[in-house]
């Protein structure tokens, strides 16, 4: 439905607070280096303008698109050229090219300082002194570090952030109350950001069809009692929501997401029996709850798939009449029967089925040709099953830290050109699959593990895309979205890699390591491990283990020493020499 003024329409639908928060998120995701105060000023100017349009939709400039209005506002920033370099060239373009240009300059790894958490009393004072500024700063800091964060979901995080401070700043033990809540929000936030980044990559790199296929599979698993037409409607609406958010259209995205939650709750009887609790919650909680809702029970007595998709004489006729609809129905029927499969596996099966039909429907005897198509699925199903079984056994044997180390070595040998911080971050996250998924029964392991790995490998892909250094990474990331994990799994040691020159400075440690948290200390040790493998890619597991054990003992010894710094200097030299000898460096 057309509106005379789009900005007035969204302001009226969303209300001032949601409008201001979403505009702040949008601006911070585009101009990631701009100071907080500058963004607040821009947001206030846009908000005041929106109010004039609400009062009179025919007022000057009120008929302009949101991209035009927001882009014009961003292009007023005085320091655009010196802060962002070539991004300033976007401002010479017209819409829609200007917005596309801004999107291309979003930085997944912006050069921003790590967020350091102040003392609890300091945070509580800041919260009480100016709650509005405190919460806006949270939105700003998260948005600029995570330029694809799902905006309406960030409002949900901010609401929980506010609730945590409201409750805990009045508590007897503020820290005991607040810190676990902030840790939980941080961890959930990182996971949410990474999941959304995959959705945006799917849309932007592989197109709407790829995203819709993913959505059909996932929603069919989640809502197996829903009819295909209902699932298709939800997929269409969900695709619109994510296309908007990934495209920077945050006001439309938030409005449409709320409409979708409303529709789902009004039609829950024909969608899922699991939605009742979600639908009793306020909007942000409701939308989040629906997105995370458990799979409904499968309908009883579902007929065999073979009848419609293999045995029927009309397979090629049905396929030819509407290829994507027929493949969509195949995916829907397969997914609703298999909550035990990962979405990416279901998509591989659908791709195999499509390839078979393309070949067989042009053959002399199509039915004879595609009669055994389901047999082709067996190895595709067994491959992730076996991989998960092996890795869960290894995880249970080693524990999370050592499992991460095994993956660090494995992935450094596969793609040693990738930067050490990226290898550490990605391998640590890959290693978390163990504690996240191996505890689940067999029926839940694959969807948990392989779909999580898709999210983590996408982090590697987007970080590598910024500064490409490995043809093998580029190949695995760009050839097929659903085969990324099998592609990386299949990589062997890179025999073309020339080992890195030994640099003693890389392996020089100081007393500051003693005051780090356990997590930070692990990262230091894992960074050293990656560097070690880059120097000696042919080192055996046993050699690496011996060096790492010596390193752990060295850190422990020097952290107990009276003169820590002297210990690190003297014992460090000995450790480096011993390690060089052990590895033949």
């Amino acid at each position: 439905d057309a509106h005379k003024s789009e900005v007035a329409h969204r302001f009226k639908d969303l209300g001032e607070e949601n409008f201001k928060a979403l505009v702040l998120i949008a601006f911070a995701q585009y101009l990631q280096q701009c100071p907080f105060e500058d963004h607040v000023k821009l947001v206030n100017e846009v908000t005041e303008f929106a109010k004039t349009c609400v009062a009179d939709e025919s007022a000057e400039n009120c008929d302009k698109s949101l991209h035009t209005l927001f882009g014009d506002k961003l292009c007023t920033v005085a320091t655009l050229r010196e802060t962002y370099g070539e991004m300033a060239d976007c401002c010479a373009k017209q819409e829609p090219e200007r917005n596309e240009c801004f999107l291309q300059h979003k930085d997944d790894n912006p050069n921003l300082p790590r967020l350091v958490r102040p003392e609890v009393d300091v945070m509580c004072t800041a919260f009480h002194d100016n709650e509005e500024t405190f919460l806006k700063k949270y939105l700003y800091e998260i948005a600029r570090r995570h330029p694809y964060f799902y905006a309406p979901e960030l409002l949900f995080f901010a609401k929980r952030y506010k609730a945590a401070f409201t409750e805990c700043c009045q508590a007897a033990d503020k820290a005991a109350c607040l810190l676990p809540k902030l840790d939980e929000l941080r961890d959930e936030g990182k996971a949410s950001s990474a999941k959304q980044r995959l959705k945006c990559a799917s849309l932007q790199k592989f197109g709407e069809r790829a995203f819709k296929a993913w959505a059909v599979a996932r929603l069919s698993q989640r809502f197996p009692k829903a009819e295909f037409a209902e699932v298709s409607k939800l997929v269409t609406d969900l695709t619109k929501v994510h296309t908007e958010c990934c495209h920077g259209d945050l006001l439309e995205c938030a409005d449409d997401r709320a409409d979708l939650a409303k529709y789902i709750c009004e039609n829950q009887d024909s969608i899922s029996s699991k939605l009742k609790e979600c639908c009793e919650k306020p909007l942000l909680e409701k939308s989040h709850c629906i997105a995370e809702v458990e799979n409904d029970e499968m309908p009883a007595d579902l007929p065999s798939l073979a009848a419609d998709f293999v045995e029927s004489k009309d397979v090629c006729k049905n396929y030819a009449e509407a290829k994507d609809v027929f493949l969509g129905m195949f995916l829907y029927e397969y997914a609703r029967r298999h909550p035990d499969y990962s979405v990416v596996l279901l998509l591989r099966l659908a791709k195999t089925y499509e390839t078979t039909l393309e070949k067989c429907c042009a053959a002399a005897d199509p039915h004879e040709c595609y009669a055994k198509v389901f047999d082709e699925f067996k190895p595709l199903v067994e491959e992730p099953q076996n991989l998960i079984k092996q890795n869960c056994e290894l995880f249970e044997q080693l524990g999370e830290y050592k499992f991460q180390n095994a993956l660090l070595v494995r992935y450094t040998k596969k793609v040693p050109q990738v930067s050490t911080p990226t290898l550490v971050e990605v391998s640590r996250n890959l290693g978390k699959v163990g504690s996240k998924c191996c505890k689940h029964p067999e029926a839940k392991r694959m969807p948990c593990a392989e779909d999580y790995l898709s999210v983590v490998l996408n982090q590697l892909c987007v970080l590598h895309e910024k500064t490409p250094v490995s043809d093998r990474v580029t190949k695995c990331c760009t050839e097929s979205l659903v085969n990324r994990r099998p592609c990386f799994s299949a990589l062997e040691v890179d025999e073309t890699y020339v080992p890195k020159e030994f640099n003693a400075e890389t392996f020089t440690f100081h007393a500051d390591i003693c005051t780090l948290s356990e997590k930070e200390r692990q990262i230091k040790k894992q960074t050293a491990l990656v560097e070690l493998v880059k120097h000696k890619p042919k080192a055996t597991k046993e050699q690496l283990k011996a060096v790492m054990d010596d390193f752990a003992a060295f850190v422990e010894k020097c952290c107990k020493a009276d003169d820590k710094e002297t210990c690190f200097a003297e014992e460090g030299k000995k450790l480096v020499a011993a390690s060089q000898a052990a590895l033949g460096l």
Epitope: K12, D13, L14, G15, E16, E17, N18, A21, K51, V54, L135, L155, F156, A158, K159, K162, A254, D255, A258, K262, P282, L283, L284, K286
Partner: nanobody, 128 residues
Framework: ELQVVESGGGLVQAGGSLRLSCAAS????????MGWFRQAPGKEREFVAA????????YYADSVKGRFAISGDNAKNTVYLQMNSLKPEDTAVYYC?????????????????????WGQGTQVTVSS
């Protein structure tokens, strides 16, 4: 034109209760949220409470949480504000607002600019 009419104001002693009513009639377009604001002499109009029809969600200003309760009848486009444990600082003209946003605010704060139609107001005086 949407008409918004409040009733139920009056004089009450501290600790007492009052129930305000508000009916919106005429065109009901965009009556997604209805709410209450108040304005004490020499002060800005401030948010009190609101109800969003789309989810039946209610939200309140911190100063009235636990004492005031907003409820509504969507079919009649009517909202009520039950005010308990009234304090002298609750003294103000109470305004009903209609044609609010479709969705509740993430931080529970509404603004006069969010609403398209207003009543004339009803006086509430709490004596000590």
């Amino acid at each position: 034109e949407l008409q918004v009419v409040e009733s139920g104001g009056g004089l009450v002693q501290a600790g007492g209760s009052l129930r305000l009513s508000c009916a919106a009639s005429g065109r009901t377009f965009r009556s997604n949220t209805m709410g209450w604001f108040r304005q004490a002499p020499g002060k800005e109009r401030e948010f009190v409470a609101a109800i969003t029809w789309s989810g039946g969600t209610t939200y309140y200003a911190d100063s009235v949480k636990g004492r005031f309760a907003i409820s509504g009848d969507n079919a009649k486009n009517t909202v009520y504000l039950q005010m308990n444990s009234l304090k002298p600082e609750d003294t103000a003209v109470y305004y009903c607002a209609a044609e609010g946003p479709k969705w509740e605010p993430w931080n529970g704060i509404a603004h006069p600019a969010d609403f398209g139609s207003w009543g004339q107001g009803t006086q509430v005086t709490v004596s000590s």
